[in-house]
């Protein structure tokens, strides 16, 4: 039942816990068949998602999946919030679920998630650092 629909593999309730000042790469896993779709990131502001125009992004191609990456170099406190990637494919707009970044300001390290909280929400630990990408603006 292989479909050639574009798929964006961001799960509902996806979350990342990150530190201000660190580099971070937010990945949008994209499956496509022939032509790579045009993918963008936006940040949720209430019910509207504001397109992130002048941000560093890159593609990483793997065998069966591609990643459209939003770079945070470094993470800033106001990067806290929910993000969504969208793909334009054959005049269709496909939107992902939102993924939430919880940014801890190093100045207020006491606000970091506790060990218990991290144990009960293991996906908070799911964090990627990839290098050698072709970056573009």
């Amino acid at each position: 039942k292989e479909s050639c629909d574009v798929q964006l593999y961001i799960k509902r309730q996806s979350e990342h816990s990150i530190l201000a000042g660190d580099p971070f790469e937010l990945e949008c896993p994209v499956k496509y068949c022939a032509n790579r779709p045009h993918v963008t990131w936006c940040k949720l502001n209430g019910t509207t998602c504001v397109k992130l125009e002048d941000r560093q992004t890159s593609w990483k191609e793997e065998k069966n999946i591609s990643f459209f990456i939003l770079h945070f170099e470094p993470v800033l406190p106001n990067d806290n919030g929910s993000y969504r990637c969208s793909a334009n494919f054959q005049s269709n707009l496909i939107e992902s679920h939102s993924t939430t970044l919880y940014v801890t300001d190093v100045k207020s390290a006491s606000e970091r998630p506790s060990k218990d909280e991290m144990a009960s929400r293991p996906w908070l630990l799911y964090r990627h650092h990839h290098h050698h990408h072709h970056h573009h603006h």
Epitope: K1, S3, Q7, R12, N64, I65, E95, H97
Partner: antibody, heavy 121, light 112 residues
């Protein structure tokens, strides 16, 4: 061709822990979009979703049973294991595992044959 | 939890005639990604459930086109254009928009 098969004890005593294994073929649980859920059906009653494990080992549970459930995967063996603690006669049901396909989120497109678990002393 | 209410619970039908099952949810199933995660399953007597329809109206592979799904928000319908003997069984709706994922209580389709 995707197939799934549940295995485990047919009879457990109250307070015991149930361990069920779902052995599958036709897909890999390391592939993006893939997942496996456990669903149960008491005799003559409706279906109830229990737990789901995604390709990246992320897990979701039915909150009403979360404290009693664990779900794990062994990608190399093509298996998913569900454990349910403190079994009670009301947990008597046919337990199914189902393949979670992806179209923006999970949906179940293939189911195992089910295994009937009776809880009785 | 989102409660899925099906009606009728029992549906006696005549072979060759149409049949319709309703499913109502206590919350909208339209997700923030623009999709509606409402599925239908068929469970024939003594068998496992089988996927019929996903995302409200997409027919799963191998499902005859006499089955169709429609609806939006909180109200959904499964239709069988001409009932055949092999359609006997229990039909369940399911929502995958809100955790925990929940099923309807089932509608039993039987031949008159």
């Amino acid at each position: 061709q995707i197939t799934l098969k549940e295995s485990g004890p047919t009879l457990v005593k109250p307070t015991q822990t149930l361990t069920l294994t779902c052995t599958f073929s036709g897909f890999s649980l390391s592939t993006f979009g893939m997942g496996v859920s456990w669903i149960r059906q008491p005799p003559g009653k409706a279906l109830e979703w229990l737990a789901h494990i995604y390709w990246d080992d992320d897990k979701r549970f039915n909150p009403s049973l979360k404290s009693r459930l664990t779900i794990t995967k062994d990608t190399s063996k093509n298996q998913v294991v569900l454990t349910m603690t403190n079994m009670d006669p009301v947990d008597t049901a046919t337990y199914y595992c189902a393949h979670g396909n992806w179209d923006g989120e999970t949906y179940f497109d293939y189911w195992g044959q089910g295994t009937l678990v009776t809880v009785s002393s | 939890d989102v409660v899925m209410t099906q009606s009728p619970l029992s549906l006696p039908v005549t072979l060759g005639q149409p049949a319709s099952i309703s499913c109502k949810s206590t919350q909208s199933l339209l997700d923030s990604d623009g999709k509606t995660y409402l599925n239908w399953f068929q469970q024939r007597p003594g068998q496992s459930p089988r996927s019929l329809i996903y995302l409200v109206s997409k027919l799963d592979s191998g499902v005859p086109d006499r089955f169709s799904g429609s609806g939006s928000g909180t109200d959904f319908t499964l239709k069988i254009s001409r009932v055949e003997a092999e359609d006997v069984g229990v039909y369940y709706c399911w929502q995958g928009t809100h955790f925990p994922w929940t099923f309807g209580q089932g509608t039993k389709v039987e031949i008159k």
